[in-house]
Interface confidence: low
Amino acid sequence: EDELQVIQPEKSVSVAAGESATLRCAMTSLIPVGPIMWFRGAGAGRELIYNQKEGHFPRVTTVSELTKRNNLDFSISISNITPADAGTYYCVKFRKGSPDDVEFKSGAGTELSVRAKPSAPVVSGPAVRATPEHTVSFTCESHGFSPRDITLKWFKNGNELSDFQTNVDPAGDSVSYSIHSTARVVLTRGDVHSQVICEIAHITLQGDPLRGTANLSEAIRVPPTLEVTQQPMRAENQANVTCQVSNFYPRGLQLTWLENGNVSRTETASTLIENKDGTYNWMSWLLVNTCAHRDDVVLTCQVEHDGQQAVSKSYALEISAHQKEHGSDITHEAALAPTAPLGGSG
Protein backbone atom coordinates (compact mmCIF):
# COMPACT_ATOMS: atom_id res chain seq x y z
CA GLU A 1 0.00 0.00 0.00
CA ASP A 2 1.31 3.48 -0.89
CA GLU A 3 2.45 5.69 1.97
CA LEU A 4 -0.21 8.05 3.28
CA GLN A 5 -0.43 11.46 1.63
CA VAL A 6 -2.02 14.54 3.20
CA ILE A 7 -3.82 16.52 0.52
CA GLN A 8 -4.85 20.16 1.06
CA PRO A 9 -6.35 20.98 -2.36
CA GLU A 10 -6.71 24.74 -1.90
CA LYS A 11 -3.62 26.91 -1.63
CA SER A 12 -5.71 29.83 -0.38
CA VAL A 13 -9.17 30.62 0.94
CA SER A 14 -10.69 34.07 1.43
CA VAL A 15 -13.51 34.60 3.90
CA ALA A 16 -15.48 37.60 5.15
CA ALA A 17 -15.23 38.35 8.86
CA GLY A 18 -18.09 36.78 10.79
CA GLU A 19 -18.51 33.94 8.30
CA SER A 20 -17.21 30.39 8.58
CA ALA A 21 -14.09 29.16 6.81
CA THR A 22 -13.89 25.62 5.48
CA LEU A 23 -10.37 24.24 5.29
CA ARG A 24 -10.17 21.06 3.23
CA CYS A 25 -7.94 18.10 3.99
CA ALA A 26 -7.98 14.48 2.83
CA MET A 27 -5.81 11.47 3.56
CA THR A 28 -5.02 8.77 1.03
CA SER A 29 -4.83 6.06 3.68
CA LEU A 30 -5.83 5.21 7.25
CA ILE A 31 -2.42 3.85 8.05
CA PRO A 32 -0.56 4.55 10.28
CA VAL A 33 -3.02 4.73 13.15
CA GLY A 34 -3.09 8.05 14.94
CA PRO A 35 -4.87 11.36 15.20
CA ILE A 36 -4.90 14.29 12.85
CA MET A 37 -4.46 17.83 14.07
CA TRP A 38 -4.85 21.24 12.52
CA PHE A 39 -2.35 24.00 13.24
CA ARG A 40 -2.04 27.62 12.28
CA GLY A 41 1.53 28.42 11.36
CA ALA A 42 4.54 26.15 11.27
CA GLY A 43 7.45 25.39 13.54
CA ALA A 44 7.71 25.50 17.30
CA GLY A 45 5.33 28.47 17.68
CA ARG A 46 2.47 26.94 15.73
CA GLU A 47 -1.02 27.21 17.23
CA LEU A 48 -3.20 24.13 17.72
CA ILE A 49 -6.57 24.68 16.06
CA TYR A 50 -8.09 21.21 16.28
CA ASN A 51 -7.06 17.87 17.73
CA GLN A 52 -9.03 14.82 16.67
CA LYS A 53 -7.96 12.86 19.73
CA GLU A 54 -8.70 15.21 22.60
CA GLY A 55 -9.49 18.72 23.68
CA HIS A 56 -12.40 21.03 23.15
CA PHE A 57 -12.58 23.40 20.22
CA PRO A 58 -15.78 25.45 20.38
CA ARG A 59 -15.37 27.21 17.03
CA VAL A 60 -14.28 24.16 15.06
CA THR A 61 -16.57 21.59 13.55
CA THR A 62 -15.55 18.64 11.38
CA VAL A 63 -17.12 18.40 7.97
CA SER A 64 -17.27 14.59 8.18
CA GLU A 65 -17.81 12.16 11.05
CA LEU A 66 -14.22 11.49 12.04
CA THR A 67 -15.05 8.50 14.23
CA LYS A 68 -16.14 6.46 11.22
CA ARG A 69 -13.44 3.95 10.33
CA ASN A 70 -13.61 4.54 6.59
CA ASN A 71 -13.50 8.33 6.77
CA LEU A 72 -10.66 9.97 4.86
CA ASP A 73 -12.00 13.52 4.94
CA PHE A 74 -10.48 15.59 7.73
CA SER A 75 -11.76 18.98 6.59
CA ILE A 76 -12.80 21.43 9.29
CA SER A 77 -15.00 24.49 9.45
CA ILE A 78 -14.01 27.39 11.71
CA SER A 79 -16.92 29.61 12.70
CA ASN A 80 -17.11 33.33 13.33
CA ILE A 81 -13.89 34.22 11.56
CA THR A 82 -12.09 37.41 12.57
CA PRO A 83 -9.01 39.08 11.04
CA ALA A 84 -6.99 37.53 13.86
CA ASP A 85 -7.63 34.11 12.27
CA ALA A 86 -5.66 34.95 9.12
CA GLY A 87 -2.65 32.75 8.46
CA THR A 88 -1.55 29.46 6.93
CA TYR A 89 -3.33 26.38 8.26
CA TYR A 90 -1.71 22.94 8.14
CA CYS A 91 -3.45 19.60 8.35
CA VAL A 92 -1.04 17.20 10.09
CA LYS A 93 -1.20 13.42 10.50
CA PHE A 94 0.26 11.98 13.69
CA ARG A 95 1.35 8.44 14.33
CA LYS A 96 0.28 7.03 17.67
CA GLY A 97 3.19 6.91 20.05
CA SER A 98 4.36 7.43 23.60
CA PRO A 99 4.95 9.47 25.58
CA ASP A 100 3.61 11.68 22.80
CA ASP A 101 2.14 11.16 19.39
CA VAL A 102 4.74 11.61 16.65
CA GLU A 103 4.21 13.88 13.64
CA PHE A 104 4.06 11.75 10.52
CA LYS A 105 3.17 13.98 7.57
CA SER A 106 1.87 17.49 6.95
CA GLY A 107 -0.20 18.94 4.16
CA ALA A 108 1.18 21.80 2.04
CA GLY A 109 -0.93 24.38 3.89
CA THR A 110 -3.89 26.59 3.07
CA GLU A 111 -3.55 30.34 3.47
CA LEU A 112 -6.65 31.90 5.03
CA SER A 113 -7.16 35.57 4.28
CA VAL A 114 -9.94 37.46 5.99
CA ARG A 115 -12.01 40.20 4.45
CA ALA A 116 -13.03 42.43 7.33
CA LYS A 117 -15.27 45.45 7.04
CA PRO A 118 -13.97 48.78 8.26
CA SER A 119 -15.65 50.13 11.37
CA ALA A 120 -18.05 53.04 10.97
CA PRO A 121 -15.95 56.14 10.30
CA VAL A 122 -15.74 58.48 13.28
CA VAL A 123 -15.33 62.12 12.34
CA SER A 124 -14.16 64.61 14.93
CA GLY A 125 -13.68 68.33 14.61
CA PRO A 126 -11.57 70.97 16.31
CA ALA A 127 -11.56 71.30 20.09
CA VAL A 128 -12.30 75.04 19.90
CA ARG A 129 -14.52 77.02 17.59
CA ALA A 130 -13.06 79.16 14.82
CA THR A 131 -14.46 82.13 12.96
CA PRO A 132 -15.23 82.40 9.24
CA GLU A 133 -12.26 82.62 6.87
CA HIS A 134 -10.20 80.48 9.25
CA THR A 135 -9.15 76.91 8.43
CA VAL A 136 -10.12 74.06 10.75
CA SER A 137 -9.10 70.42 10.72
CA PHE A 138 -11.41 67.42 10.83
CA THR A 139 -10.19 63.88 11.41
CA CYS A 140 -11.74 60.63 10.27
CA GLU A 141 -10.84 57.23 11.67
CA SER A 142 -11.87 53.68 10.82
CA HIS A 143 -10.41 50.42 12.04
CA GLY A 144 -10.32 46.67 11.68
CA PHE A 145 -10.48 46.25 7.92
CA SER A 146 -8.72 43.79 5.68
CA PRO A 147 -7.34 43.69 3.02
CA ARG A 148 -5.35 46.94 3.21
CA ASP A 149 -6.66 48.57 0.02
CA ILE A 150 -9.18 51.27 0.92
CA THR A 151 -10.44 54.58 -0.49
CA LEU A 152 -11.33 57.62 1.59
CA LYS A 153 -12.98 60.80 0.34
CA TRP A 154 -14.04 64.00 2.06
CA PHE A 155 -17.09 66.09 1.19
CA LYS A 156 -18.47 69.39 2.39
CA ASN A 157 -22.17 69.76 1.62
CA GLY A 158 -21.80 67.23 -1.19
CA ASN A 159 -18.76 68.88 -2.71
CA GLU A 160 -15.60 66.79 -2.70
CA LEU A 161 -12.67 68.25 -0.78
CA SER A 162 -9.07 68.02 -1.93
CA ASP A 163 -7.10 69.36 1.03
CA PHE A 164 -6.62 66.25 3.15
CA GLN A 165 -3.96 63.75 4.16
CA THR A 166 -4.60 60.04 4.74
CA ASN A 167 -2.57 57.27 6.36
CA VAL A 168 -3.25 53.54 6.49
CA ASP A 169 -1.54 51.66 9.33
CA PRO A 170 0.43 49.54 9.74
CA ALA A 171 2.56 49.91 6.62
CA GLY A 172 3.50 46.22 6.55
CA ASP A 173 1.45 43.04 6.61
CA SER A 174 -1.14 42.77 9.37
CA VAL A 175 -4.30 40.86 10.20
CA SER A 176 -6.23 44.15 10.01
CA TYR A 177 -5.65 47.81 9.27
CA SER A 178 -6.69 51.29 10.38
CA ILE A 179 -7.13 54.47 8.38
CA HIS A 180 -6.67 58.01 9.65
CA SER A 181 -7.35 61.09 7.57
CA THR A 182 -7.19 64.81 8.33
CA ALA A 183 -9.06 67.32 6.16
CA ARG A 184 -8.59 71.09 6.24
CA VAL A 185 -11.76 73.11 5.77
CA VAL A 186 -12.05 76.88 5.33
CA LEU A 187 -15.06 78.17 7.24
CA THR A 188 -17.55 80.60 5.74
CA ARG A 189 -20.29 82.62 7.44
CA GLY A 190 -22.92 80.31 5.99
CA ASP A 191 -21.43 77.13 7.44
CA VAL A 192 -23.67 76.80 10.49
CA HIS A 193 -25.82 74.33 8.57
CA SER A 194 -22.88 72.74 6.74
CA GLN A 195 -21.66 69.17 7.16
CA VAL A 196 -18.40 67.46 6.41
CA ILE A 197 -18.61 63.84 5.37
CA CYS A 198 -15.88 61.22 5.42
CA GLU A 199 -16.67 58.42 2.95
CA ILE A 200 -14.89 55.08 2.99
CA ALA A 201 -15.00 52.49 0.20
CA HIS A 202 -13.68 48.96 0.70
CA ILE A 203 -14.02 45.63 -1.09
CA THR A 204 -16.10 44.26 1.79
CA LEU A 205 -18.74 46.98 1.41
CA GLN A 206 -19.94 45.85 -2.01
CA GLY A 207 -20.07 49.35 -3.42
CA ASP A 208 -22.04 50.77 -0.51
CA PRO A 209 -19.55 53.08 1.21
CA LEU A 210 -19.54 53.91 4.89
CA ARG A 211 -19.97 57.53 5.90
CA GLY A 212 -19.16 59.51 8.98
CA THR A 213 -20.36 63.06 9.44
CA ALA A 214 -19.60 66.11 11.51
CA ASN A 215 -21.58 69.32 11.73
CA LEU A 216 -19.68 72.55 11.18
CA SER A 217 -22.03 74.10 13.72
CA GLU A 218 -19.81 72.45 16.34
CA ALA A 219 -16.71 74.08 14.89
CA ILE A 220 -17.80 77.55 13.87
CA ARG A 221 -18.31 80.79 15.74
CA VAL A 222 -19.89 83.65 13.79
CA PRO A 223 -19.36 86.89 15.72
CA PRO A 224 -22.28 89.31 15.85
CA THR A 225 -22.58 92.66 14.10
CA LEU A 226 -23.98 95.47 16.26
CA GLU A 227 -26.12 98.43 15.27
CA VAL A 228 -27.33 101.02 17.77
CA THR A 229 -30.16 103.34 16.66
CA GLN A 230 -32.61 105.73 18.24
CA GLN A 231 -36.27 105.07 17.64
CA PRO A 232 -38.80 107.91 17.43
CA MET A 233 -40.84 108.54 20.61
CA ARG A 234 -44.06 110.54 21.19
CA ALA A 235 -42.96 111.61 24.64
CA GLU A 236 -40.58 114.56 24.43
CA ASN A 237 -38.65 113.60 27.57
CA GLN A 238 -37.98 109.97 26.59
CA ALA A 239 -35.57 108.39 24.11
CA ASN A 240 -35.78 104.79 22.90
CA VAL A 241 -32.41 103.40 21.86
CA THR A 242 -32.14 99.91 20.35
CA CYS A 243 -29.16 97.60 19.89
CA GLN A 244 -29.59 95.19 17.04
CA VAL A 245 -27.32 92.14 17.40
CA SER A 246 -27.20 90.30 14.09
CA ASN A 247 -25.95 87.10 12.50
CA PHE A 248 -24.21 85.40 15.39
CA TYR A 249 -23.64 81.76 16.26
CA PRO A 250 -23.77 79.95 18.65
CA ARG A 251 -26.58 81.26 20.86
CA GLY A 252 -24.67 82.19 24.00
CA LEU A 253 -24.72 85.97 24.25
CA GLN A 254 -24.74 88.56 27.04
CA LEU A 255 -25.51 92.22 26.46
CA THR A 256 -24.68 95.15 28.71
CA TRP A 257 -25.94 98.71 28.36
CA LEU A 258 -23.65 101.49 29.60
CA GLU A 259 -24.60 105.14 30.09
CA ASN A 260 -21.53 107.33 29.96
CA GLY A 261 -19.43 104.27 30.77
CA ASN A 262 -21.52 103.15 33.75
CA VAL A 263 -23.34 99.84 33.63
CA SER A 264 -27.03 100.41 33.30
CA ARG A 265 -28.31 96.90 32.67
CA THR A 266 -27.01 93.42 31.79
CA GLU A 267 -29.14 90.77 30.17
CA THR A 268 -28.71 87.35 28.61
CA ALA A 269 -30.17 86.72 25.18
CA SER A 270 -33.18 84.46 25.40
CA THR A 271 -35.80 84.80 22.67
CA LEU A 272 -33.71 84.69 19.52
CA ILE A 273 -34.69 84.94 15.91
CA GLU A 274 -33.05 82.26 13.77
CA ASN A 275 -31.98 83.19 10.29
CA LYS A 276 -32.12 80.86 7.29
CA ASP A 277 -28.36 80.36 7.46
CA GLY A 278 -28.59 79.17 11.07
CA THR A 279 -27.24 82.35 12.66
CA TYR A 280 -29.29 84.32 15.16
CA ASN A 281 -30.53 87.89 15.59
CA TRP A 282 -31.53 89.61 18.80
CA MET A 283 -32.55 93.12 19.77
CA SER A 284 -32.38 94.92 23.08
CA TRP A 285 -33.74 98.36 23.79
CA LEU A 286 -33.10 100.98 26.38
CA LEU A 287 -35.66 103.63 27.35
CA VAL A 288 -33.80 106.74 28.54
CA ASN A 289 -35.50 109.45 30.56
CA THR A 290 -33.78 112.51 29.11
CA CYS A 291 -35.00 114.71 31.94
CA ALA A 292 -32.54 112.93 34.18
CA HIS A 293 -29.58 114.18 32.18
CA ARG A 294 -28.09 117.72 32.04
CA ASP A 295 -25.57 116.80 29.37
CA ASP A 296 -25.40 114.64 26.29
CA VAL A 297 -25.33 110.87 26.98
CA VAL A 298 -23.12 108.28 25.36
CA LEU A 299 -25.01 104.98 25.30
CA THR A 300 -22.91 101.89 24.71
CA CYS A 301 -24.20 98.43 23.74
CA GLN A 302 -21.58 95.90 24.81
CA VAL A 303 -21.91 92.28 23.76
CA GLU A 304 -19.99 89.25 24.99
CA HIS A 305 -20.54 86.34 22.61
CA ASP A 306 -19.66 82.71 23.31
CA GLY A 307 -17.16 83.65 26.01
CA GLN A 308 -15.13 85.84 23.63
CA GLN A 309 -13.83 89.35 24.26
CA ALA A 310 -16.69 91.83 24.31
CA VAL A 311 -17.49 93.98 21.29
CA SER A 312 -19.37 97.24 21.61
CA LYS A 313 -21.07 100.01 19.68
CA SER A 314 -21.85 103.45 21.07
CA TYR A 315 -24.49 106.04 20.33
CA ALA A 316 -24.39 109.69 21.36
CA LEU A 317 -27.78 110.82 22.62
CA GLU A 318 -28.05 114.64 22.43
CA ILE A 319 -29.94 116.41 25.23
CA SER A 320 -31.59 119.58 23.90
CA ALA A 321 -31.11 122.92 25.65
CA HIS A 322 -34.83 122.95 26.52
CA GLN A 323 -34.53 119.58 28.30
CA LYS A 324 -31.38 120.67 30.12
CA GLU A 325 -33.15 123.75 31.55
CA HIS A 326 -36.16 121.81 32.76
CA GLY A 327 -34.28 118.84 33.99
CA SER A 328 -31.84 120.46 36.38
CA ASP A 329 -33.65 119.37 39.54
CA ILE A 330 -34.56 115.87 38.35
CA THR A 331 -32.32 113.19 39.85
CA HIS A 332 -34.16 109.86 39.28
CA GLU A 333 -32.47 107.20 37.16
CA ALA A 334 -33.29 106.38 33.59
CA ALA A 335 -36.23 104.01 33.12
CA LEU A 336 -35.40 100.69 31.51
CA ALA A 337 -37.78 98.99 29.15
CA PRO A 338 -37.91 95.23 28.60
CA THR A 339 -36.28 93.78 25.50
CA ALA A 340 -38.20 93.07 22.36
CA PRO A 341 -37.18 90.86 19.43
CA LEU A 342 -36.60 92.26 15.98
CA GLY A 343 -37.64 90.44 12.84
CA GLY A 344 -35.11 88.08 11.29
CA SER A 345 -32.94 89.11 8.38
CA GLY A 346 -32.84 85.93 6.32
Epitope: H56, P58, R59, T62, N80
Partner: antibody, heavy 118, light 107 residues
Protein backbone atom coordinates in the same frame (compact mmCIF):
# COMPACT_ATOMS: atom_id res chain seq x y z
CA UNK B 1 -30.60 40.91 25.32
CA UNK B 2 -28.90 37.52 25.64
CA UNK B 3 -31.09 35.32 27.81
CA UNK B 4 -31.77 31.70 28.73
CA UNK B 5 -35.12 30.65 30.19
CA UNK B 6 -35.63 27.12 31.53
CA UNK B 7 -38.98 25.38 31.90
CA UNK B 8 -40.39 21.88 32.39
CA UNK B 9 -39.42 21.27 36.00
CA UNK B 10 -41.82 19.82 38.51
CA UNK B 11 -42.60 16.93 40.81
CA UNK B 12 -42.12 13.43 39.45
CA UNK B 13 -42.08 9.98 41.02
CA UNK B 14 -38.91 7.88 41.11
CA UNK B 15 -38.52 6.03 37.81
CA UNK B 16 -40.49 8.70 36.00
CA UNK B 17 -39.47 11.01 33.15
CA UNK B 18 -39.30 14.74 32.63
CA UNK B 19 -38.18 16.91 29.74
CA UNK B 20 -36.53 20.23 30.52
CA UNK B 21 -36.47 23.00 27.94
CA UNK B 22 -34.25 26.04 27.63
CA UNK B 23 -35.30 28.86 25.31
CA UNK B 24 -32.45 31.04 24.10
CA UNK B 25 -32.87 34.61 22.94
CA UNK B 26 -30.41 37.22 21.77
CA UNK B 27 -28.06 34.72 20.15
CA UNK B 28 -28.01 31.62 17.94
CA UNK B 29 -27.90 28.63 20.25
CA UNK B 30 -26.39 26.32 17.66
CA UNK B 31 -23.25 28.49 17.48
CA UNK B 32 -22.37 27.73 21.08
CA UNK B 33 -21.66 24.71 23.22
CA UNK B 34 -24.55 24.42 25.66
CA UNK B 35 -24.67 22.81 29.07
CA UNK B 36 -26.94 21.67 31.87
CA UNK B 37 -25.72 22.19 35.44
CA UNK B 38 -27.67 21.20 38.54
CA UNK B 39 -27.66 22.09 42.21
CA UNK B 40 -29.34 20.13 44.98
CA UNK B 41 -30.80 22.27 47.77
CA UNK B 42 -28.02 23.47 50.05
CA UNK B 43 -25.37 21.72 47.95
CA UNK B 44 -22.79 22.73 45.37
CA UNK B 45 -22.92 22.91 41.59
CA UNK B 46 -22.70 19.77 39.46
CA UNK B 47 -22.16 19.71 35.71
CA UNK B 48 -24.65 17.32 34.08
CA UNK B 49 -24.39 17.38 30.30
CA UNK B 50 -23.21 19.31 27.25
CA UNK B 51 -23.85 19.49 23.54
CA UNK B 52 -21.21 20.84 21.17
CA UNK B 53 -21.69 22.93 18.08
CA UNK B 54 -21.15 19.79 16.01
CA UNK B 55 -23.88 17.98 17.93
CA UNK B 56 -21.40 16.01 20.05
CA UNK B 57 -22.86 15.16 23.48
CA UNK B 58 -21.31 14.62 26.89
CA UNK B 59 -22.70 13.44 30.24
CA UNK B 60 -21.59 13.09 33.81
CA UNK B 61 -21.30 9.46 34.91
CA UNK B 62 -24.37 9.37 37.15
CA UNK B 63 -26.76 10.32 34.31
CA UNK B 64 -25.24 8.41 31.38
CA UNK B 65 -27.84 6.21 29.73
CA UNK B 66 -30.69 7.99 31.53
CA UNK B 67 -30.44 11.59 30.34
CA UNK B 68 -30.30 12.84 26.74
CA UNK B 69 -29.29 16.36 25.74
CA UNK B 70 -30.49 17.76 22.43
CA UNK B 71 -31.26 21.01 20.70
CA UNK B 72 -33.71 22.27 18.12
CA UNK B 73 -32.10 24.97 16.02
CA UNK B 74 -35.37 26.14 14.49
CA UNK B 75 -36.72 26.91 17.96
CA UNK B 76 -33.34 28.10 19.28
CA UNK B 77 -33.93 25.74 22.20
CA UNK B 78 -32.00 23.24 24.28
CA UNK B 79 -33.53 20.18 25.92
CA UNK B 80 -32.70 17.63 28.60
CA UNK B 81 -34.73 14.44 28.48
CA UNK B 82 -34.52 12.79 31.90
CA UNK B 83 -35.60 9.17 32.25
CA UNK B 84 -35.43 6.68 35.14
CA UNK B 85 -35.33 9.56 37.58
CA UNK B 86 -33.98 9.04 41.09
CA UNK B 87 -34.31 11.00 44.33
CA UNK B 88 -30.66 11.99 43.89
CA UNK B 89 -31.64 13.87 40.72
CA UNK B 90 -33.67 16.35 42.78
CA UNK B 91 -32.14 19.75 42.13
CA UNK B 92 -32.45 23.09 40.42
CA UNK B 93 -31.35 22.59 36.80
CA UNK B 94 -29.62 25.45 35.04
CA UNK B 95 -29.15 25.92 31.31
CA UNK B 96 -25.74 27.47 30.62
CA UNK B 97 -24.04 28.86 27.52
CA UNK B 98 -20.38 28.06 26.85
CA UNK B 99 -18.20 30.91 25.65
CA UNK B 100 -17.35 31.02 21.97
CA UNK B 101 -13.58 30.94 22.50
CA UNK B 102 -12.94 28.34 25.16
CA UNK B 103 -16.33 27.06 26.35
CA UNK B 104 -16.09 29.00 29.60
CA UNK B 105 -19.61 29.37 30.99
CA UNK B 106 -20.83 32.90 30.44
CA UNK B 107 -24.64 33.02 30.44
CA UNK B 108 -26.83 31.21 32.99
CA UNK B 109 -30.58 30.71 33.03
CA UNK B 110 -32.62 31.31 36.17
CA UNK B 111 -33.07 27.58 36.79
CA UNK B 112 -35.99 25.17 37.02
CA UNK B 113 -36.70 22.93 40.02
CA UNK B 114 -36.97 19.16 39.59
CA UNK B 115 -38.27 17.17 42.55
CA UNK B 116 -38.17 13.38 42.45
CA UNK B 117 -40.28 11.99 45.27
CA UNK B 118 -42.96 9.45 45.92
CA UNK C 1 -12.59 12.67 36.66
CA UNK C 2 -10.66 15.75 37.72
CA UNK C 3 -11.30 16.66 41.35
CA UNK C 4 -11.46 20.32 42.34
CA UNK C 5 -10.77 21.25 45.97
CA UNK C 6 -11.51 24.71 47.31
CA UNK C 7 -10.24 26.21 50.53
CA UNK C 8 -11.44 27.41 52.87
CA UNK C 9 -14.97 26.03 52.84
CA UNK C 10 -16.17 29.15 54.64
CA UNK C 11 -14.62 32.49 55.37
CA UNK C 12 -15.65 35.43 57.59
CA UNK C 13 -14.48 38.87 56.58
CA UNK C 14 -15.35 42.53 56.98
CA UNK C 15 -16.29 45.19 54.45
CA UNK C 16 -13.10 46.61 52.96
CA UNK C 17 -11.07 43.44 53.53
CA UNK C 18 -8.98 41.75 50.86
CA UNK C 19 -9.76 38.05 50.64
CA UNK C 20 -8.26 35.14 48.73
CA UNK C 21 -9.88 31.81 47.92
CA UNK C 22 -7.81 28.94 46.56
CA UNK C 23 -8.69 26.08 44.26
CA UNK C 24 -6.60 23.00 43.51
CA UNK C 25 -7.07 20.55 40.64
CA UNK C 26 -6.19 16.88 40.96
CA UNK C 27 -4.30 17.07 37.66
CA UNK C 28 -2.93 19.71 35.31
CA UNK C 29 -5.79 21.68 33.74
CA UNK C 30 -3.61 24.26 31.95
CA UNK C 31 -5.49 27.49 32.66
CA UNK C 32 -9.02 26.25 31.96
CA UNK C 33 -10.42 27.38 35.28
CA UNK C 34 -13.48 29.52 35.92
CA UNK C 35 -14.84 31.25 39.02
CA UNK C 36 -18.52 31.83 39.80
CA UNK C 37 -20.42 33.82 42.42
CA UNK C 38 -23.78 32.67 43.73
CA UNK C 39 -26.17 34.39 46.10
CA UNK C 40 -28.99 32.52 47.90
CA UNK C 41 -31.92 31.69 45.63
CA UNK C 42 -30.15 33.05 42.55
CA UNK C 43 -28.39 31.53 39.55
CA UNK C 44 -24.59 31.59 39.60
CA UNK C 45 -22.86 34.56 37.98
CA UNK C 46 -19.76 34.07 35.85
CA UNK C 47 -16.82 36.09 37.15
CA UNK C 48 -13.57 34.79 35.66
CA UNK C 49 -12.55 32.44 32.84
CA UNK C 50 -9.21 31.04 31.73
CA UNK C 51 -8.00 31.56 35.30
CA UNK C 52 -7.57 35.32 35.11
CA UNK C 53 -9.84 36.92 32.48
CA UNK C 54 -12.80 38.90 33.78
CA UNK C 55 -16.19 38.40 32.16
CA UNK C 56 -17.80 41.53 30.74
CA UNK C 57 -19.28 43.76 33.44
CA UNK C 58 -17.37 42.15 36.32
CA UNK C 59 -15.68 44.81 38.49
CA UNK C 60 -11.90 44.87 38.54
CA UNK C 61 -11.81 44.25 42.29
CA UNK C 62 -12.10 40.58 41.29
CA UNK C 63 -8.91 38.98 40.02
CA UNK C 64 -7.77 35.45 39.34
CA UNK C 65 -4.42 33.80 38.90
CA UNK C 66 -2.78 30.43 38.55
CA UNK C 67 -2.00 27.72 36.02
CA UNK C 68 -1.61 23.97 36.04
CA UNK C 69 -3.13 22.78 39.31
CA UNK C 70 -3.16 25.77 41.72
CA UNK C 71 -5.42 28.79 41.33
CA UNK C 72 -6.63 31.74 43.41
CA UNK C 73 -9.52 34.20 43.39
CA UNK C 74 -8.88 37.53 45.09
CA UNK C 75 -11.40 40.21 45.98
CA UNK C 76 -9.44 43.37 46.67
CA UNK C 77 -11.92 45.33 48.78
CA UNK C 78 -15.04 43.56 49.99
CA UNK C 79 -18.37 45.31 49.61
CA UNK C 80 -21.68 44.16 51.14
CA UNK C 81 -22.81 42.77 47.77
CA UNK C 82 -19.75 40.49 47.59
CA UNK C 83 -20.84 38.23 50.46
CA UNK C 84 -21.90 35.06 48.66
CA UNK C 85 -20.71 31.55 47.81
CA UNK C 86 -17.88 31.22 45.29
CA UNK C 87 -17.20 28.17 43.12
CA UNK C 88 -14.25 27.23 40.93
CA UNK C 89 -14.65 24.95 37.92
CA UNK C 90 -12.34 23.16 35.54
CA UNK C 91 -13.42 22.97 31.93
CA UNK C 92 -10.39 21.44 30.28
CA UNK C 93 -12.05 18.05 29.86
CA UNK C 94 -15.37 16.33 30.43
CA UNK C 95 -16.89 15.82 32.83
CA UNK C 96 -16.51 19.44 33.88
CA UNK C 97 -16.20 19.60 37.64
CA UNK C 98 -16.76 22.24 40.30
CA UNK C 99 -15.13 22.86 43.64
CA UNK C 100 -17.36 22.35 46.67
CA UNK C 101 -17.74 26.11 47.16
CA UNK C 102 -16.48 28.74 49.60
CA UNK C 103 -19.09 30.62 51.61
CA UNK C 104 -17.97 34.19 52.26
CA UNK C 105 -19.78 35.64 55.27
CA UNK C 106 -19.80 39.02 57.00
CA UNK C 107 -17.76 39.01 60.19
Amino acid sequence: EVQLVESGGGLVQPGGSLRLSCAASGFTLSSYDMHWVRQATGKGLEWVSAIGTAGDTYYTGSVKGRFTISRENAKNSLYLQMNSLRAADTAVYYCVRGGVWDDAFDIWGQGTMVTVSS
Amino acid sequence: DIQMTQSPSSLSASVGDRVTITCRASQDINNYLAWFQQKPGKAPKSLIYTASSLHSGVPSKFSGSGSGTDFTLTISSLQPEDFATYYCQQYVSYPYTFGQGTKLEIK
